[in-house]
């Protein structure tokens, strides 16, 4: 069923690919130590080598369901007509602590499966009670979850996940953390990590906003830590530009919701609308996103230590028509300092009793801040009242690169040698690879530099990961995996076309007068042995 | 299950301090998801907030306008209880008073004291 | 300071519905929660959040909240209905209590 490795690219040597002309993919993830890869698809699993050959696939699908059944038919007899259904796979999440995949995937109302990373081997079923189910949305790229290891020898693991909800807001919450046991037979597997009479660790689309507005969802598109928090880049319907009118225009927006790793009581929900623009032109729907480290010249640029966190974002233009956004689309930097500053000035200016909750989708009134003693540092992880807050002020990213033509649609980012290499994967299949530079000649924040072609056609989807070593890219669409080498310098057959590349990775080794990188070159430290510089072509 | 137990003197004499004490079972004083209220009923009918202490990695207190310059509530963490003290009283402190828990201002006095009838008379 | 004021009586015959209004500025803003006080006990907590029940309390209380007025409503009243409402909320760093209301069981 699923095709072996053959030849892709263009022009460059033969990248490998994974093909499965059967089962759309939809999910990638890399194993940090073995390089290994999984890919999460309709009714199948696999897992594949660092060289995209075929290990072992899993079944998962077609299954006999339907999405009326409540609980699923293999629990519960249904009224509702059984019929063979898709199993999308919609998470895919390495669980390392416990030698673990979570798989999630559309079938059974949304339930996971844990299978072993050896041989994908299914480890215990769910015990099929309400919190297993995260919701039947068939939509690949629209739930995102964070897995939380406990702390070593002792506490459990859980996992933060959003999915959106299709107005079923009586079964689904849209954001929820759940316990993850190491036995996956235990009871509580999936249990909420926190639930009394007034809290628990979810949260839920009111009833009275699907009444108000019966399309409104939430998407999460990605989400990540950073230090003690848990961050979600969403899209959801703007309930403040979108008429009630079913038949009316829909307009999204882009939110980052932020939550403390350890708030069981989702207390510390904060969520604040966000975008970039340039020229006038506003960027308001996000596509994808990647935290990174920023590398020594760029953090010097932003004013950051080289440890502190940065996100990458690709955000669509303008608001409306989230599943086909239009192709004109900008590279955006977010820093972490400057989103967690901007928070926390929202938080200590409501406990000083200034202004609104401004949550309308979740709160349907307008709550107003509550004045408190309080004391609101970096770590505050909020308190029973002044809760769930909402931002008013889009928090603006720096838009580094536009594209007007092919759209971006995925992203990636590393740094080498103290430099920071973006990849961004397009509409048309095509791999961008882009230096970041904020102090570039002519006031330009970044260089294409480079531009390969992953898949001819198919756009690229959002998990866009790199291998351990950082030597190749694995780039995916919806049906094939294609490893892509994170530079292809022995391209460039003379010091000029190579230097004149402004490929990173790339410098002129005399020894062989050949294009590599600085570690591919015998002696490249001695003098006059590897140029790494244009000018050094000449001296040459 | 939660439960509050009142203890302190029926009568104080006018100008002098009043003073009750709620011993928590079933929950912890320090809890940071509750806090532990103080409310009276005049004989008339009417409820009234006096105060609240609650523990957000240190110990806070809201008093209420009325009384805020003689009221203290004190948290007592080794003998999880907690106490109130209204200085100078008058007659028209007379009142029956609640220790009570909250689940935050949002979900209301969830779990209430017996409650203590007090007179101030000499 | 903030009021919330309520009609002092309301009588209803059993198994008819109740209506207790509260009102206050711009309460439709806050949450409002209601306390049933039964003669002779403390009172006992019966909605919060405008209309969410705590566990043990029967389906035929609810509550709603918008604009200056929240209301609670004892749907198919019985006997052992008939005590004191309170509607409360929070304002300025105070909870504030609603003047009451007797429900008489006719």
């Known amino acids: 069923e699923a095709g072996l490795p053959r030849a892709g690219g263009g022009s460059q040597p033969p990248f490998r690919t994974f093909s499965a002309s059967d089962w759309g993919l939809t999910h990638l993830v890399v194993h940090e130590q073995t390089g290994e890869v999984y890919v999460g698809a309709v009714n199948r699993i696999y897992k594949l080598s660092g060289n995209l050959t075929l290990l072992r696939a899993h079944v998962t699908g077609p299954v006999e369901d339907n999405e009326k059944c409540y609980p699923p038919p293999s629990v519960q007899s249904c009224p509702h007509g059984l019929g063979s259904t898709d199993n999308v796979n919609k998470l895919l999440l390495l669980d390392y602590a416990a030698n673990r995949l979570l798989a999630c995937g559309s079938a059974s109302q949304g339930i996971c499966q844990f299978l072993r990373l050896d041989d994908l081997f299914k480890l215990g079923e769910p015990h099929h009670r309400k919190e297993h189910y995260l919701s039947s949305v068939q939509e690949a790229g629209s739930m995102a979850g964070v897995l939380i290891a406990g702390p070593p020898g002792q506490g459990q693991a859980k996992l933060f996940v959003g999915t959106p909800i299709d107005g079923k807001s009586e079964y689904f919450p849209t954001l929820s953390s759940r316990r993850l046991m190491a036995n996956e037979e235990d009871a509580d597997m999936f249990g909420f990590v926190y639930q009394d009479e007034f809290v628990s660790s979810q949260l839920k689309i009111p009833s009275d906003t699907l009444s108000k507005f019966p399309a409104f969802d939430i998407y999460y598109v990605y989400s990540f830590r950073s230090e003690q928090f848990v961050y979600y880049l969403t899209l959801q319907l703007d309930t403040q530009l979108t008429s009630p009118d079913a038949a009316g225009e829909h307009f999204f927006t882009s939110k980052i919701v932020r939550l403390c790793v350890d708030d069981p009581k989702f207390y510390s929900y904060v969520e604040f609308p966000i975008g970039c623009e340039q020229a006038g032109v506003e960027y308001r729907l996000v596509q994808d996103a990647y935290l990174s480290r920023p590398g020594r010249a760029l953090a010097h640029q932003l004013g950051l230590a080289e440890d502190e966190d940065v996100l990458f974002t690709v955000f669509a233009q303008g608001q409306k028509n989230r599943v086909k956004p239009p192709k004109e689309s900008a590279l955006c930097l977010f820093t972490l300092r400057a989103i967690k500053e901007k928070i926390k000035e929202r938080i200590q200016s409501c406990y000083r009793g200034e202004g609104k909750l401004s949550l309308p989708w979740l709160l349907n009134k307008e709550l107003g801040c509550i004045n408190s003693p309080l004391q609101i540092d970096d770590d505050f992880c909020g308190q029973d009242f002044n809760q769930p807050l909402g931002g008013t002020v889009t928090i603006e990213g720096t838009p580094l690169f536009v594209d007007k033509d092919d759209g971006l649609t995925a992203v990636a980012a590393y740094d080498y040698r103290g430099r920071t290499v973006v990849f961004a994967g397009t509409r048309s299949g095509r791999i961008r690879k882009i230096l970041v530079d904020l102090s570039n000649p002519g006031g330009r924040p970044a260089l294409a530099y480079e531009s390969v072609v992953a898949q001819e056609g198919s756009p690229i989807l959002r998990d866009l990961v790199l291998s351990p070593n950082h030597q190749y890219l694995y780039a995916m669409t919806e049906k094939q995996v294609t490893r892509v080498p994170v530079e292809s310098c022995v391209q460039y057959t003379s010091c000029e076309l190579c230097l004149g590349s402004r490929d990173p990775h790339c410098g002129w080794c005399v020894l062989h007068s050949i294009c590599s990188r600085r570690d591919a070159c015998e002696r490249a430290d001695e003098p006059q042995r590897f140029a790494a510089d244009l000018l050094q072509c000449v001296q040459l | 299950q939660v439960q509050l137990q009142q203890s302190g003197p029926g009568l104080v004499k006018p100008s002098q301090t009043l003073s009750l004490t709620c011993a928590i079972s079933g929950d912890s004083l320090s809890s940071t998801s509750a806090a532990w209220n103080w409310i009276r009923q005049s004989p008339s009918g009417g409820l009234e907030w006096l105060g609240r202490?609650?523990?957000?990695?240190?110990?806070?207190?809201d008093y209420a306008v009325s009384v805020k310059s003689r009221i203290t509530i004190n948290p007592d963490t080794s003998k999880n209880q907690f106490s109130l003290q209204l200085n100078s009283v008058t007659p028209e402190d007379t009142s029956v008073y609640y220790c009570?828990?909250?689940?935050?201002?949002?979900?209301?006095?969830?779990?209430w004291g017996q409650g203590t009838m007090v007179t101030v008379s000499s | 300071s903030y009021e919330l004021t309520q009609p002092p009586s309301v009588s209803v015959s059993p198994g008819q519905t109740a209506s207790i209004t509260c009102s206050g500025d711009k309460l439709g803003d806050k949450y409002a929660s209601w306390y049933q006080q039964r003669p002779g006990q403390s009172p006992l907590l019966v909605i919060y959040?405008?209309?969410k029940r705590p566990s043990g309390i029967p389906q035929r209380f609810s509550g709603s909240n918008s604009g200056n007025t929240a209301t609670l409503t004892i749907s198919g009243t019985q006997a052992m209905d008939e005590a004191d409402y309170f509607c409360?909320?929070?304002?300025?760093?105070?909870?504030?209590f609603g003047t009451g209301t007797k429900v008489t069981i006719l």
């Open positions: 409360q909320a929070w304002d300025s760093g105070t909870f504030v």
């Open positions: 959040q405008d209309n």
């Open positions: 202490t609650y523990y957000r990695s240190k110990w806070y207190n």
């Open positions: 009570a828990r909250d689940r935050g201002y949002y979900n209301g006095v969830d779990v």
